[in-house]
Interface confidence: medium
Amino acid sequence: GELETSDVVTVVLGQDAKLPCFYRGDSGEQVGQVAWARVDAGEGAQELALLHSKYGLHVSPAYEGRVEQPPPPRNPLDGSVLLRNAVQADEGEYECRVSTFPAGSFQARLRLRVLVPPLPSLNPGPALEEGQGLTLAASCTAEGSPAPSVTWDTEVKGTTSSRSFKHSRSAAVTSEFHLVPSRSMNGQPLTCVVSHPGLLQDQRITHILHVSFLAEASVRGLEDQNLWHIGREGAMLKCLSEGQPPPSYNWTRLDGPLPSGVRVDGDTLGFPPLTTEHSGIYVCHVSNEFSSRDSQVTVDVLDPQEDSGKQVDLVSAS
């Protein structure tokens, strides 16, 4: 006869491990007992359990409540046992020793491998600001056994670096993602992808990038100066900028206070019917926590009466 077992039994932490040991004997042969022992190198054999044809299953005190026979129906030649709720410390070599009659004893070894799935964590780097050089965007750490694989999934251009720390029964892998911050990266996802044989599917943790910036400010509304004449209604100036965080707007007049009747509505300055009083230099001040910008324009309210009396001299230079 001969013993049938597996070279390696792989189980995920917390699952039950079936340690197979089946005696394929000739007709008339009987199995008297099957002894299971842990036989790690450098240490003596430690009995795990003994299945006896007459006395039943005996379990070592160290494994009390954790070793069982597989559920019925059972073959009397099957010496397999179940190791409940596998822990990392169970990883190692096991020996099955079968005593048969009349053929004698047979033994076989297997290795139990306990996979410890990682629980990844993602840590964002320092605040990202446009104008910085290469900066840490995020780091992702996962510890498991065997060592997990940590990669990044993103449309953002950047560089990665990984390092690994080995512990007695596991390994921790940390991967860092560095980039040169730009406003185009705002709102872009940066996803840490962790792969491991103990996971049914990759674990993904997504971080949304926030890059602080403030665009140059500009003022719209003066494109056609001829529209800015006495009596015109609905004239307005609009301050254009964008930023992260969203900026706030403030309007002032450089050559004095804002004229009465002028309404400030965020980025927009609204004028009552225009008078010459409204001529002047207006400043839009844009700011967020990252920076501030100014843009100024000169408003010159035209008096149509004056313009019609003026003559235009054309001077040609040759």
């Epitope: 008297g32 007992q33 022992a37 009995e47 005996h58 070592s60 009659f101 009349p102």
Partner: nanobody, 118 residues
Framework: EVQLVESGGGLVQPGGSLRLSCAAS????????MGWYRQAPGKQREYVAT???????NYADSVRGRFTISRDNAENTVYLQMDSLRAEDTAVYYC????????????WGRGTQVTVSS
């Protein structure tokens, strides 16, 4: 040949405790399984508990949680600690040992009387 000699039996009140010993005439480490059976008057011999040379144990459901089997391979002795004894535990307790070679050879002691009565 292996001689097994039991001791420790006696009369005890319900709820009391006794400790039985069984000394073997040869190294118990070569004795693969040692254990205890019992036989009450007019009944068949009944399995109580067994222990392997490596210390793995098994118990009959009727005694699990009340009796504890242990062995000292250096002293060639197996013990049965009996707690929370009941009247139905009254019986002659026999020590058994099995040697595995080409086939199982089982040895028996002569028994020790345990009586649980008030």
């Amino acid at each position: 040949e292996v001689q097994l000699v039991e001791s420790g039996g006696g009369l005890v009140q319900p709820g009391g405790s006794l400790r039985l010993s069984c000394a073997a005439s040869r190294s118990t480490f070569s004795l693969n399984i040692m254990g205890w059976y019992r036989q009450a008057p007019g009944k068949q011999r009944e399995y109580v508990a067994t222990i392997t040379s490596g210390g793995s144990t098994n118990y009959a459901d009727s005694v699990r949680g009340r009796f504890t089997i242990s062995r000292d391979n250096a002293e060639n002795t197996v013990y049965l600690q009996m707690d929370s004894l009941r009247a139905e535990d009254t019986a002659v307790y026999y020590c058994t040992a099995e040697l595995v070679r080409r086939g199982p050879t089982t040895y028996w002691g002569r028994g020790t009387q345990v009586t649980v009565s008030s």
